[in-house]
């Protein structure tokens, strides 16, 4: 077990916009003072030290020894720092990809944005909250996976042909559920167990196949942390 | 090599003010956060004060809140505590302390300490 | 504010020995736990921060582990040099606070 593997795992899917949770009990009755908060996230890359941005040395402190349980860790940086007038510094590549909230700070939340999230984001990360009279932290790790549909067999389909659709995240544990359904015009239809249709776990197997089945055909993989992914795939059945 | 040194008159009696200096070498002082932690006689350690690098943000143990005030010379390298209203209980051996970074709450370096000792 | 209890005052051990020192936290900390050791006549030294992290310098013998309430130090084979107080001490919020310390003795 690799330390940090004990904070709080938040899980994305890479290419899509990641949200970081840091709502912070706060003992404060006064929520006007949420003005003055400061907010600092770091990031501990899980492999491959982050390159300095020019002009943005990383933060000082102690260069952090092999943990007791793990091999030489890449040195953390600041992604985003924004002080108590509102004013922001991070590291330059990420700058556009993060966000914070600034009506979600007022109200105590101090969640990280990524938008995206890509794979050099995973590793651990630490919001430290200052507010005027107590200072205090979240810490969780983020782990990113790939979401993908495949056919089997793969390609264009004729018809009364079969194919097996699986849907698929890469993330150790089986989602908690899995539902499909067909992207019609009017939105999305629900696909049930049927004759045509046999749904077991992630795959969907279509018997026989016909034109009307070519189009878009999604998934949606809930997880038990309630982290979801929607996946999509377009068939093509010829006449 | 990192050094924090303290300095300060260790003898008041009760009602009395103090100030505690903390000289700091080795490191970029501007560049960490600080604290002053306290050690009582029967070994305790308590946190008592922290500044940030900045001195944006000041937090006191609410023992001391209102009667200790912590303070920074960045050009001089000196960490200040200044202490008034004293009382008995606020005897202990006094740590000037580096913090890790602003942002992670822990104390990598620790000075000699500078007793203080609160009697009449 | 968050209390760090150290259940053991004293524990003594013999040289080669591998000894355990628990700290529990009164509410969750997730990782957010330092150790240090503090020599007779001598200042507190980090050994361990978030949990489980050697601190620069720090022998390997010296390794920490937990998350959330409950934290252990471990000694995996005592040296007479490890005569010292321990402490624990959270730095997820503030106030920042210790646990009682624990005694290392060696018999």
């Known amino acids: 077990l690799q330390p940090g593997a004990e904070v709080p795992v938040v899980w994305a899917q890479e290419g899509a916009p990641a949200q970081l949770p840091c709502s912070p009990t706060i003992p404060l009755q006064d929520l006007s003072l949420l003005r003055r908060a400061g907010v600092t996230w770091q990031h501990q890359p899980d492999s491959g030290p982050p390159a300095a941005a020019p002009g943005h040395p990383l933060a000082p402190g102690p260069h952090p020894a092999a943990p007791s349980s793990w091999g030489p860790r890449p040195r953390r940086y600041t992604v985003l720092s924004v002080g108590p007038g509102g004013l922001r510094s991070g590291r330059l590549p990420l700058q556009p990809r993060v966000q914070l909230d600034e009506r979600g700070r007022q109200r105590g939340d101090f969640s990280l944005w990524l938008r995206p999230a890509r794979r050099a984001d995973a590793g651990e990360y630490r919001a430290a909250v200052h507010l005027r009279d107590r200072a205090l932290s979240c810490r969780l790790r983020l782990r990113l996976g790939q979401a993908s549909m495949t056919a089997s067999p793969p390609g264009s389909l004729r018809a009364s042909d079969w194919v097996i659709l699986n849907c698929s995240f890469s993330r150790p544990d089986r989602p908690a559920s899995v539902h499909w359904f067909r992207n019609r015009g009017q939105g999305r239809v629900p696909v049930r167990e049927s004759p045509h249709h046999h749904l077991a776990e992630s795959f969907l197997f279509l018997p026989q196949v016909s034109p009307m089945d070519s189009g878009p055909w999604g998934c949606i993989l809930t997880y038990r942390d309630g982290f979801n992914v929607s996946i999509m795939y377009n068939l093509t059945v010829l006449g | 090599d990192v050094k924090l040194v303290e300095s300060g008159e260790d003898l008041v009696k009760p009602g009395g003010s103090l100030k505690l200096s903390c000289a700091a070498s080795?490191?970029?002082?501007?560049?960490?956060?600080m604290s002053w932690v306290r050690q009582t006689p029967e070994k305790r350690l308590e946190w008592v004060a922290y500044v940030t690098s900045g001195g944006d943000y000041i937090y006191y143990a609410d023992t001391v809140k209102g009667r200790f005030t912590i303070s920074r010379d960045d050009v001089r390298n000196t960490l200040y505590l200044q202490m008034s209203s004293l009382k008995s209980e606020d005897t202990a051996m006094y740590y000037c302390?580096?913090?890790?970074?602003?942002?992670?709450?822990?104390?990598?370096?620790w000075g000699t300490g500078a007793p203080v000792t609160v009697s009449s | 504010d968050i209390v760090m209890t150290q259940s053991h005052k004293f524990m003594s051990t013999s040289v080669g020995d591998r000894v355990s020192i628990t700290c529990k936290a009164s509410q969750d900390v997730t990782t957010a736990v330092a150790w240090y050791q503090q020599k007779p006549g001598q200042s507190p030294k980090l050994l361990i921060y978030?949990?489980?992290y050697r601190y620069t310098g720090v022998s390997d013998r010296f390794t920490g582990s937990g998350s959330g309430t409950d934290f252990t130090f471990t000694i995996s084979s005592v040296q007479a040099e490890d005569l010292a107080l321990y402490y624990c001490q959270q730095h997820d919020s503030s106030p920042w606070t210790f646990g009682g310390g624990t005694k290392l003795e060696i018999k």
């Open positions: 302390t580096r913090v890790a970074y602003d942002y992670e709450w822990y104390f990598d370096v």
């Open positions: 978030s949990a489980s």
């Open positions: 080795g490191f970029t002082f501007s560049s960490y956060a």
